[in-house]
C-alpha cells in the first residue's frame, strides 16, 4: 500500500505564438481545479477507461478575474498535493491523465458551469520511494508544470511497496533470514505469512493470515478450480472435488441493471451499482449533469446540479456533437475562394491564397497592376492573379525594361534581310518578293499577288514596299 502524490507547480500559456485567452473574465470570474487519473502499465488507454490505480480531485484554486487587455498569466493554483492512495503493490509503470478544469462563478443555473481547459497524458516508469520527478506537458497553447512521486505507507517498503517492515526486536540484528529494511536500517523486513496451506500458485495475501484467490480458483486455500461446465449438480454449494459453481436462478440472472450497471445479490433481492450518469433501481434513469464532465475537447458545460436537469455543451470552434466529441472537417465546406488552400488549425481556419488574391477567405481579387509600372511606354494587363506588360515596339521582358532585338525572331520572309530601325524593323526583300515582311511574291508579268492595287495605282506600275 502507498500513495501517489502530484504537485502542480504552474498552469499558464506555453511558449511560442498564439497565447491563449484568459479563461476568466470580469463578468464571469472563475477558479481552477485539477483531476488526476492513474492506470497501471503503459497501455495507451482511452481517457474514458476506468482509473484502475485511482483518481483524485484537487481543491478549488483562488478566484481569478481577468485584467482587461492583459494576456493570460500563470493562473492561481489550489493549495496542497493531489494524493491517490493505492492498496495493492505499486506497478512501477503507469499511465496518467491530468485534467485542468475551470469552474465559473457567475449567475449560474443551479450549479457552477465547468469546462475542461486542458488534458495532458503520459506513460512513465517510477519506483516507489524515489525522489520527486519533474515534468512539463503541453496541451494546445497551455503548459502544465508538475512533479510526482510514489511513496509507500508503513509498514510497506521497497520499489513496489510489497515488503513489510517491523521495528527490530533486538537492537543489534534482524532475525534469521530477515534483512534490514533500507533505508530504515533500524527496522527489519517482516515475513508476510499467509494462512497456513494457502496455495502458493493460486492464492496470495496482503495481510498476514489471509488467503485470497486469483481468478479461476476458489476454496479457503484457493486449491479448487472454478468451472462452469462439466457440472451436473443443480445450483447449490460447490463440489469439493470439482469446484463446480453452477449458477441457478438468482435475482441477478440476466442482469436486471441497465446502462452497464453491475448487479449484486442482497439477502432480499438485488442491488445495482450504476455507472456515472445513471441512477434509479435498475440504472434506468439517465442523470448526467455537468458534475460528470460530459463535454469533451474544451466544451463548456451548462446545466443544473439536479440529476433531472438537462445540460448542454457549448463547443469550441472545430467540434460538434452533443458532447463536442466530433471533430468538424471545416475544409470540406470549401470555404477558401479563388483556389485558396484550406488549413484547419483546430482553433481556427486559415486560407492560403493564390497570388493575386487576399482576405480571410481569399475573397479579394487584388488589383494586379496596382503599383506595377510597365517601363518604356508599356501598358499593364491584369488577369488570373498576375500582371503582364504589353510592351511598346522595341522593348520586351516582364516590365518592358529590356531593349528588344526586333530581328531576333527572323520576321522577314523568303530570305529577306532584316535591319533594326528606331521605329521597329525594315525588311530588304530578295528579288521576286515584296511587302513589309517580304511576304508577297512578285508575278513574272509585273503584277503582284496583292488582291487589289492601292488607290491611285494601276496594276503593273512600279511599287516599293519597305
Amino acid at each position: 500500500a502507498g500513495v501517489f502524490e502530484l504537485q502542480i507547480h504552474s498552469f499558464g500559456p506555453g511558449p511560442g505564438p498564439g497565447a491563449p485567452r484568459s479563461p476568466c473574465s470580469a463578468r464571469l470570474p472563475c477558479r481552477l481545479f485539477f483531476r488526476v487519473c492513474l492506470k497501471p502499465g503503459l497501455s495507451e488507454e482511452a481517457a474514458e477507461s476506468p482509473c484502475a490505480l485511482g483518481a483524485a480531485l484537487s481543491a478549488r484554486g483562488p478566484v481569478y478575474t481577468e485584467q482587461p487587455g492583459a494576456p493570460a498569466p500563470d493562473l492561481p493554483l489550489p493549495d496542497g498535493l493531489l494524493q491517490v492512495p493505492f492498496r495493492d503493490a505499486w506497478p512501477g509503470t503507469f499511465s496518467f491523465i491530468i485534467e485542468t478544469w475551470r469552474e465559473e462563478l457567475g449567475d449560474q443555473i443551479g450549479g457552477p458551469a465547468w469546462s475542461l481547459l486542458a488534458r495532458v497524458a503520459g506513460r512513465r516508469r517510477l519506483a516507489a520511494g524515489g525522489p520527486w520527478a519533474r515534468d512539463i506537458q503541453r496541451a494546445g497553447a497551455w503548459e502544465l508544470r508538475f512533479s510526482y512521486r510514489a511513496r509507500c505507507e508503513p509498514p510497506a517498503v521497497g520499489t513496489a511497496c510489497t515488503r513489510l517492515c517491523r521495528p527490530r526486536s533486538a537492537p543489534s540484528r534482524c532475525g534469521p533470514g530477515l534483512r534490514p529494511c533500507a533505508p530504515l536500517e533500524d527496522e527489519c523486513e517482516a515475513p508476510l505469512v499467509c494462512r497456513a496451506g494457502c496455495s502458493p500458485e493460486h492464492g496470495f495475501c496482503e495481510q498476514p493470515g489471509e488467503c485470497r484467490c486469483l481468478e479461476g480458483w476458489t476454496g479457503p486455500l484457493c486449491t479448487v478450480p472454478v468451472s462452469t461446465s462439466s457440472c451436473l449438480s443443480p445450483r447449490g454449494p460447490s463440489s469439493a472435488t470439482t469446484g463446480c459453481l453452477v449458477p441457478g436462478p438468482g435475482p441477478c440472472d440476466g442482469n436486471p441493471c441497465a446502462n452497464g450497471g453491475s448487479c449484486s445479490e442482497t439477502p432480499r433481492s438485488f442491488e445495482c451499482t450504476c455507472p456515472r450518469g445513471f441512477y434509479g433501481l435498475r440504472c434506468e434513469v439517465s442523470g448526467v449533469t455537468c458534475a460528470d464532465g460530459p463535454c469533451f475537447n474544451g466544451g463548456l458545460c451548462v446545466g443544473g446540479a439536479d440529476p433531472d436537469s438537462a445540460y448542454i455543451c457549448h463547443c469550441p470552434p472545430g467540434f460538434q456533437g452533443s458532447n463536442c466529441e466530433k471533430r468538424v472537417d471545416r475544409c470540406s465546406l470549401q470555404p477558401c475562394r479563388n483556389g485558396g488552400l484550406c488549413l484547419d488549425l483546430g482553433h481556427a481556419l486559415r486560407c492560403r491564397c493564390r497570388a493575386g488574391f487576399a482576405g480571410p477567405r481569399c475573397e479579394h481579387d487584388l488589383d494586379d497592376c496596382a503599383g506595377r509600372a510597365c517601363a518604356n511606354g508599356g501598358t499593364c494587363v491584369e488577369g488570373g492573379g498576375a500582371h503582364r506588360c504589353s510592351c511598346a515596339l522595341g522593348f520586351g521582358g516582364r516590365d518592358c525594361r529590356e531593349r528588344a532585338d526586333p530581328c531576333a525572331a527572323r520576321p522577314c520572309a523568303h530570305g529577306g534581310r532584316c535591319y533594326a530601325h528606331f521605329s521597329g524593323l525594315v525588311c530588304a526583300c530578295a528579288p521576286g518578293y515584296m511587302g513589309a515582311r517580304c511576304e508577297f511574291p512578285v508575278h513574272p508579268d509585273g503584277a503582284s499577288a496583292l488582291p487589289a492595287a492601292p488607290p491611285g495605282l494601276r496594276p503593273g506600275d512600279p511599287q516599293r514596299y519597305l
Epitope: 451548462v302 455543451c313 463547443c315
Partner: nanobody, 115 residues
Framework: EVQLVESGGGEVQPGGSLRLSCGPS????????VGWVRQAPGKQRNLVAG???????NYAQSVKGRFTISRDNAKNTVYLQMSSLRAEDTAVYYC?????????WGQGTLVTVKP
C-alpha cells in the same frame, strides 16, 4: 445592458399547452448556446431544455417527449413548446443564452398549471 425578454407564460389546466418565446434579441445568434431554465418555489434553477451552438438539443428527464425547444436564427428568437403540462411544471421560466465569455438572462415568465 442588453437583456432577454420572455413572453407566452400564463395559467393553464393540466394537460394543456403553452408556447414561450424569447426575443427577438441581437444576443440570440447561432454562435450562442440557448436554453430555458425554470425555478419552482423553494427549488434551485434547472435547465429544462437547451440548444447548443452546434445545434444539439437536450432536455431534462421530466419533460422529454412533452417539451420542444427550437430557435429561429433569422428572427433571433428561441421558443419552448410545452404540451401535456403537469402541476409540477409550475415555475418561473427564464430564457438563457451564453457563449464562452458571457451569459445572459431574461426576467422570467410565470407558468402556472392548476385545475
Amino acid at each position: 445592458e442588453v437583456q432577454l425578454v420572455e413572453s407566452g407564460g400564463g395559467e393553464v389546466q393540466p394537460g394543456g399547452s403553452l408556447r414561450l418565446s424569447c426575443g427577438p434579441s441581437e444576443i440570440i445568434t447561432s454562435d450562442k448556446s440557448v436554453g430555458w431554465v425554470r425555478q419552482a418555489p423553494g427549488k434551485q434553477r434547472n435547465l429544462v431544455a437547451g440548444i447548443s451552438n452546434v445545434g444539439s438539443t437536450n432536455y431534462a428527464q421530466s419533460v422529454k417527449g412533452r417539451f420542444t425547444i427550437s430557435r429561429d436564427n433569422a428572427k433571433n428568437t428561441v421558443y419552448l413548446q410545452m404540451s401535456s403540462l403537469r402541476a409540477e411544471d409550475t415555475a418561473v421560466y427564464y430564457c438563457y443564452a451564453r457563449d464562452f465569455e458571457n451569459e445572459y438572462w431574461g426576467q422570467g415568465t410565470l407558468v402556472t398549471v392548476k385545475p
